[in-house]
Interface confidence: low
């Protein structure tokens, strides 16, 4: 006869490991007992369990509640055991010793490999600002056994560098993604992809890039000169800019306070029915946590009685 077993048994952390040991013999042969032991280079041989044809399963107290026989139906020649809820410390060498009658004893040795799937963590780098040089966008760390693979999936142009720390029972891999920040990267996904034999599918963690910037400011509203005549209603000036974080807008008048009746609503300056008193230099001040910009325009409210005058539009930052 002979033993049917496996050289390597691979199981994911927390799952049950079936350690196979089946005696394939002649019909008249019987298995008296199967002794299971853990073979540890440091601790030597420790008994795991004993399967006896008469007295059943006896489990070493150190493995109490952790070793069972496979569920019925069971073949009397099957000496396999289940190691419940495998942990990293279970990884190592195991042997089964089978006592048969009349053929004698057989033994087999196998390695239990416990895969520890990584639980990746993504750490965003320092705040990204347009104008910076090569900057850390994010780092992604995954620790597992064996060492996981950590890569990046993104449309953003950048560089990645990885390093690993090897521990006695696992390896931690850290990959860093560096880029030169630009506003076009805003809202772009940066995904850490972790592959590992203990995972059914890759683990993905996505970080949405935020790049601080502030665009130049400009003022719209003076394009139609006909709107800026005495008596006209609904005249507005709109300050145009964009930024991240979204900018705040502030309106002032360079040559004095804002005229009464002029309403500030965010980026828009609304005028009451126009009078010549509304003529002047208006300044839009745009700011966010990164920077600030100014744009000014000269408003000249024309009196229809004096058509010779023209609207003057001056923008400056």
């Amino acid at each position: 006869g002979e033993l049917e077993t496996s050289d390597v048994v691979t199981v994911v952390l927390g799952q049950d490991a079936k350690l196979p040991c089946f005696y394939r013999g002649d019909p008249d042969e019987q298995v008296g007992q199967v002794a299971w032991a853990r073979v540890d280079p440091n601790e030597g041989i420790r008994e795991l369990a004993l399967l006896h044809s008469k007295y059943g399963l006896h489990v070493n107290p150190a493995y109490e509640d952790r070793v069972e026989q496979p569920p019925p139906p069971r073949d009397p020649l099957d000496g396999s055991v289940l190691l419940r809820n495998a942990v990293q410390a279970d990884e190592g060498e195991y042997e089964c010793r089978v006592s048969t009658f009349p053929a004698g004893s057989f033994q087999a040795r196998m390695r239990l490999r416990v895969l520890v799937p990584p639980l990746p963590s993504l750490n965003p780098g320092p705040p990204l600002e347009e104008g910076q040089g090569l900057t850390l966008a994010a780092s992604c760390t995954a620790e597992g056994s064996p060492a996981p693979s950590v890569t990046w999936d993104t449309e953003v142009k950048g560089t990645q560098s990885s390093r690993s720390f090897t521990h006695p029972r696992s390896a931690a891999v850290t990959s860093e993604f560096h880029l030169v920040p630009s506003r076009s990267m805003n809202g772009q996904p940066l995904t850490c992809v972790v592959s590992h034999p203990g995972l059914l599918q890759d683990r993905r963690i996505t970080h949405t890039l935020q790049v601080a910037f502030l665009a130049e400011a400009s003022v719209r509203g003076l394009e139609d000169q006909n709107l800026w005549q005495v008596g006209r209603e609904g005249a507005t000036l709109k300050c145009l800019s964009e930024g991240q974080p979204p900018p705040k807008y502030n309106w002032t008048r360079l040559d004095g306070p804002l005229p009464s009746g002029v309403r500030v609503k965010g980026d828009t300056l609304g005028f009451p029915p126009l009078t010549t008193e509304h003529s002047g230099v208006y300044v839009c001040h745009v700011s966010n946590e990164l920077s600030s910009r100014d744009s000014q325009v000269t408003v000249e409210v024309l009196d229809p009685e004096d058509p010779g005058k023209q609207v003057d539009l001056v923008s400056a930052s």
Epitope: N123, G125, L136, S139, T141, T159, S161, S162, R163, F165, T166, H167, T174, E176, H178
Partner: antibody, heavy 120, light 111 residues
């Protein structure tokens, strides 16, 4: 403002144990490893180990694996290092230090240090 | 473990001159992109202060007279021009693998 406030100096007898604390404030405690560093008088620095405040998992310099135990209390954002079976060789200043990104940037924040003196 | 050997052990430099401190690692601590080597300054009674990270990146708030260079196994910290307040001990440290290790230190004094 990131601050690491360590417990005061300790005078302990040989064979005894001591537990040093490091109270963290001004940042997300669970987001960064806490490291411990030893500096004997007039000597260089030795990395003892690090603890992950998120799950309490720790990694040690093999030289200190039987000497130091690193723990954390998330509720009080405090890291602890217990030193056991003290001898005169353990007399030193011990620092906690915060690691921004797994060591890749070095130790940017340090506690003020705790002097441990082992003497009969 | 990676061993970091610093030289010289002590150094006396005149004000305004250049101080150069070397650190040699027993194995490479450089990837294709970065070197995992850092420099610290320590004054008596104080914890170390991070000066340079990634071999050459100046930490925020550190004067520009400090600079770092090198890759692979050989790294250098330069201070120029040296000022009185630079009197201290300087250490290199790697974060390539666990355990992290520090160099033996270089004591800088003014002539």
């Amino acid at each position: 403002e990131v601050q690491l406030q360590q417990s005061g100096p300790d005078l302990v007898k040989p064979g005894a144990s001591v537990k040093i604390s490091c109270k963290a404030s001004g940042y997300s405690f669970t987001g960064h490893y806490m490291h411990w560093v030893k500096q004997s008088h007039g000597k260089s620095l030795e990395w003892i180990g690090r603890v992950n405040p998120n799950n309490g998992g720790s990694s040690y310099n093999q030289k200190f694996k039987d000497k130091a135990i690193l723990t954390v209390d998330k509720s009080s954002t405090t890291a602890y290092m217990e030193l056991r079976s003290l001898t005169s060789e353990d007399s030193a200043v011990y620092y906690c230090a915060r690691d921004p990104l797994g060591g890749s940037y070095g130790f940017a924040y340090w506690g003020q240090g705790t002097l441990v003196t082992v003497s009969a | 473990d990676i061993v970091l050997t610093q030289s010289p052990a002590s150094l006396a430099v005149s004000l305004g001159q250049r101080a150069t401190i070397s650190c040699r690692a027993s194995q490479s601590v450089t990837t294709s992109s970065y070197s995992y080597m850092h420099w610290y300054q320590q004054k008596p009674g104080q914890p170390p202060k991070l000066l340079i990270k990634y071999a050459s990146n100046l930490e925020s708030g550190v004067p520009a007279r400090f600079s770092g260079s090198g890759s692979g196994t050989d790294f250098t910290l330069n201070i120029h021009p040296v000022e009185e307040e630079d009197t201290a001990t300087y250490y290199c440290q790697h974060s390539w693998e666990i355990p992290y290790t520090f160099g033996g230190g270089t004591k800088l004094e003014m002539k």
